[in-house]
């Protein structure tokens, strides 16, 4: 769970151990120098690519040991109460469409994560945000067009879904004041936006665990 201090630290890949070692070496050699992260990542990546299997072995062993530690700790880890209980969401409900920025992130997140393996999820998001903000309006158009199409489809699907009636809506009667209907939709939109961000974070965490070293 997010923010649980008792949750075991995520397992580190062999490449992550290598980057950590690089960083420590760099700090020893240049204790006062500030690190140009882009350059540093690039140099690390280039060095890793030229290393022999034997040289990488040390880091692979560290990663194996860390994986074992993580699995061991996860066996005894009990998530905080309520964490596993998510509010009920009808699995058949149409999924909220992604925003233009979300589509853009899906496209370029692998590149950013791949080129800068040491970046945290937050830093990856920050870099993607910078890329998006530095993008001219006409370059954003393809993503905006696609997002608009998906939104249109979602609106049709959600209208059909609501017309069919939600599991509990039938009991309560469908007639509602326009005002409360509008309010409810706004709340749902807010909830869905939170979910979208949460899903993106989860996806990121999963990807990080799945990423194989090159």
């Amino acid at each position: 769970g997010k923010g649980d201090p008792k949750k075991p630290r995520g397992k580190m890949s062999s490449y992550a151990f290598f980057v950590q070692t690089c960083r420590e070496e760099h700090k020893k050699k240049h204790p006062d120098a500030s690190v140009n992260f882009s350059e540093f990542s690039k140099k690390c990546s280039e060095r890793w690519k030229t290393m022999s299997a034997k040289e990488k072995g040390k880091f692979e062993d560290m990663a194996k040991a860390d994986k074992a530690r993580y699995e061991r700790e996860m066996k005894t880890y009990i998530p905080p109460k309520g964490e596993t209980k998510k509010k009920f969401k009808d699995p058949n409900a149409p999924k909220r469409p992604p925003s233009a920025f979300f589509l853009f992130c899906s496209e370029y997140r692998p590149k950013i994560k791949g080129e800068h393996p040491g970046l945290s999820i937050g830093d990856v998001a920050k870099k993607l945000g910078e890329m998006w903000n530095n993008t001219a309006a006409d370059d954003k158009q393809p993503y905006e067009k696609k997002a608009a199409k998906l939104k249109e489809k979602y609106e049709k699907d959600i209208a059909a879904y609501r017309a069919k009636g939600k599991p509990d809506a039938a009991k309560k009667g469908v007639v509602k004041a326009e005002k409360s209907k509008k309010k409810k939709e706004e709340e749902e939109d807010e909830e869905d936006e939170e979910d979208e961000e949460e899903e993106e974070d989860e996806e990121d965490e999963e990807e990080e665990e799945d990423d194989d070293d090159e």
Partner: antibody
Amino acid sequence: EVQLLESGGGLVQPGGSLRLSCAASGFTFSWYDMTWVRQAPGKGLEWVSSISPSGGYTKYADSVKGRFTISRDNSKNTLYLQMNSLRAEDTAVYYCTTEFYDYLDVWGKGTTVTVSS
Amino acid sequence: DIQMTQSPGTLSLSPGEGATLSCRASQSVSSTYLAWYQQKPGQAPRLLIYEASKRATGTPARFSGSGSGTDFTLSISSLEPEDFAVYYCQHRHNWPPQWTFGQGTKVEVK
């Protein structure tokens, strides 16, 4: 070693079709935008088309819009350019290129397309 | 659409001399998206300068880029024999890229 290798060029009659391929190796192809640039004999460089990492987004120069189609197969690490309704002015060396690690861009050696009757 | 115009078309110089190549955009562009390429006969182009003034990997220190808005310059402090080539300025849009090249400046031996 990072490499791009174009193929599929040749002599074709006006109105004909040709499909260029670009085989990529030495990097994670599916992370990167890919681009075709061409150069007519004795002339300058002209951007032709680009495609996003997933292949979901494409852009074309006005001179080729509606006639050329860029696509990619990430499972095969290959970029394509389907060229239809070819004209004499499409005669050029076609380069496949990508940006790799902070503006260190990589270009293929090019493949020659000649449109002539 | 943005047009990039380079001048002069040809520059005749001797080794050891300095060179100044100019590139003008038809409207103001961000220096983030301005690059310079070098191309030798029978070879693919090679990136020299990106973001108007940053040297790409492997670009010698004698090459420098400057400028902002609509006017950009590539300078070669002292020409080496291998610097005689055609130079292109390039403006880019992103994601996926859309590139606009200038028509090129040929630097030839006097």
